[in-house]
Amino acid sequence: AGVFELQIHSFGPGPGPGAPRSPCSARLPCRLFFRVCLKPGLSEEAAESPCALGAALSARGPVYTEQPGAPAPDLPLPDGLLQVPFRDAWPGTFSFIIETWREELGDQIGGPAWSLLARVAGRRRLAAGGPWARDIQRAGAWELRFSYRARCEPPAVGTACTRLCRPRSAPSRCGPGLRPCAPLEDECEAPLVCRAGCSPEHGFCEQPGECRCLEGWTGPLCTVPVSTSSCLSPRGPSSATTGCLVPGPGPCDGNPCANGGSCSETPRSFECTCPRGFYGLRCEVSGVTCADGPCFNGGLCVGGADPDSAYICHCPPGFQGSNCEKRVDRCSLQPCRNGGLCLDLGHALRCRCRAGFAGPRCEHDLDDCAGRACANGGTCVEGGGAHRCSCALGFGGRDCRERADPCAARPCAHGGRCYAHFSGLVCACAPGYMGARCEFPVHPDGASALPAAPPGLRPGDPQRYL
């Protein structure tokens, strides 16, 4: 015997465009309540079939009136848990239906009117006594966030609530092979007859005749230590039984991921990467088909018509994971080429391109010179996303339309004077200098440093720069 507990965290608009209209209005204030229906196993059952594991109805939530013009927020919820008691063993796998109902409080003839706002359903694998499992389900434009767990009612314990506890016979400890009944430390597990020979230290059973091994032990009787690479990279003290160093506590120790899931540590806890066909925080949900709606965030379920054939989720852009459960930082894939800036708008990616580039991914290098004429005999040169003109002598500016002042850049060195000339510029060098730009000093003996002055031109004569 035990209790299934459901905690609703929020009910409100889901992601995506087009927020739903508020279910309540100033004219028709309303309040929400929830109904949960549980059925054993993962069998295909109609919504109308009986809730064989039990059902529960929540209290009514606070009265809510929509603020005119405001989008529908997360709606106010009833207080407390929904509790579904179960009398027999907890089945481990179960189907659920959670319905969100609206109670309209306007001037209804014959009392308040009820209407079903959203219904979500799913199938899950869950061990009793485990931690709260978190879930998100969508119904149309609505999103329901909730947690659930199954816990045993004393004296029952175990993952199926089938093991029983009894008061201790001795004040200090339980009998051989029996453990205290957490959280009732003053009680002991009632003896179960495990498989003959099952190790009392490293094995246990939840059903008569079985032998299940504790972490680190294997074999039919749990007498064989599991040799792992942890001996090579110790994190903790040596184990006397194996001579192997047992790792110290870490979030992935004992691999909390079921069904072959791989565990990776995160700053706060751990994350399981589940093989196809399994999902949930610990990859605990299996036997899933497309009919179970395993693809989140708008994913499309492909294949998986029956539990034996694996399904694949085709995820909308922006989501990944075997069930489209993980949001992708799409800009991390650097989709914008040529130095474009990536913007992830949620529903789409945008690239803001640098000058000279265009296209959805900045993939097109614009022909900078296309349709750009350089005047006065200049030639267009492409480069760096901007065109420039290489101008003919005597012209300048972006398009070579300006008549250049060749002396503007003060090209004559060592105090030489510049004269504009029809074919360029002429430098009149100061005494002691020569060359086209007056760049060479003249030696005192009258001989010049390289190069020699052209014939017929004395040092100090104006040098025309050709």
């Epitope: 465009p17 434009a141 379920c301 852009p317 959805p360």
Partner: antibody
Framework: QVQLQESGPGLVKPSETLSLTCTVS????????WSWIRQPPGKGLEWIGY???????NYNPSLKSRVTMSVDTSKNQFSLKLSSVTAADTAVYFC????????????WGQGTMVTFSS | EIVLTQSPGTLSLSPGERATLSCRAS???????LAWYQQKPGQAPRLLIY???SRATGIPDRFSGSGSGTEFTLTISRLEPEDFAVYYC?????????FGQGTRLEIK
């Protein structure tokens, strides 16, 4: 705004292969899934398949053996090839964009009528 | 595959009236992955509703969708002359993507 334009022959001989191209304007083809849907004269809509720029495809099982889709990101185009056509394949062929919040078709081309006749 | 059955096949109403179109799925459509489209003669379909109840961009608020599981409804609260067309439902939760056979909404 985003536009889709189908192009291809209006008349194809039976047993030949139909080739259609959809040119996408004003949005990157790599941001969405893209699909083909057809509609025989006077009848309802039939989904043919979709493609993502990464090469992921999904085809309607009823046509899978005859359908091939491809995408050319450099031209912002995707295409459909339907082999071994018969008169039963006569239809208006639409290309469409799949929305990013689920596989509904939020933008459609205007459609191209393809007749299969010798 | 999920078979979608629309009813009625044809609906004859007058402008200003309320139209209710039904779409029934052969299996539960998870997370309400259902859309509605409007198609006029010679045109491509136009998305009206997605996620069973969310209006697509630019769709007037006289169009509304509801339902979950296997039963879905498109309601046009007050018919305008331009609303007379063929309406299709489509599921996109489970491959292959399928459409209903359509409901023709005609002027009475």
């Amino acid at each position: 705004q985003v536009q889709l334009q189908e192009s291809g022959p209006g008349l194809v001989k039976p047993s030949e292969t139909l080739s259609l191209t959809c040119t996408v304007s004003n949005v990157s083809i790599s941001s969405y899934y893209w699909s083909w849907i057809r509609q025989p004269p006077g009848k309802g809509l039939e989904w043919i398949g979709y493609i993502y720029y990464s090469g992921t495809t999904n085809y309607n099982p009823s046509l899978k053996s005859r359908v091939t889709m491809s995408v050319d990101t450099s031209k912002n185009q995707f295409s459909l090839k339907l082999s071994s056509v018969t008169a039963a394949d006569t239809a208006v062929y639409f290309c469409a964009r799949l929305s990013n919040w689920g596989f509904a078709f939020d933008i459609w081309g205007q459609g191209t009528m393809v007749t299969f006749s010798s | 595959e999920i078979v979608l059955t629309q009813s009625p096949g044809t609906l004859s109403l007058s402008p200003g009236e309320r139209a209710t179109l039904s779409c029934r799925a052969s299996q539960t459509i998870s997370s309400s992955y259902l859309a509605w489209y409007q198609q006029k003669p010679g045109q491509a379909p136009r998305l009206l509703i997605y996620g069973a109840s969310s209006r697509a961009t630019g769709i007037p608020d006289r169009f509304s969708g509801s339902g979950s599981g296997t039963e879905f409804t498109l309601t046009i609260s007050r018919l305008e002359p331009e609303d007379f067309a063929v309406y299709y439902c489509q599921q996109y939760g489970w491959s292959p993507i399928t459409f209903g056979q359509g409901t023709r909404l005609e002027i009475k």
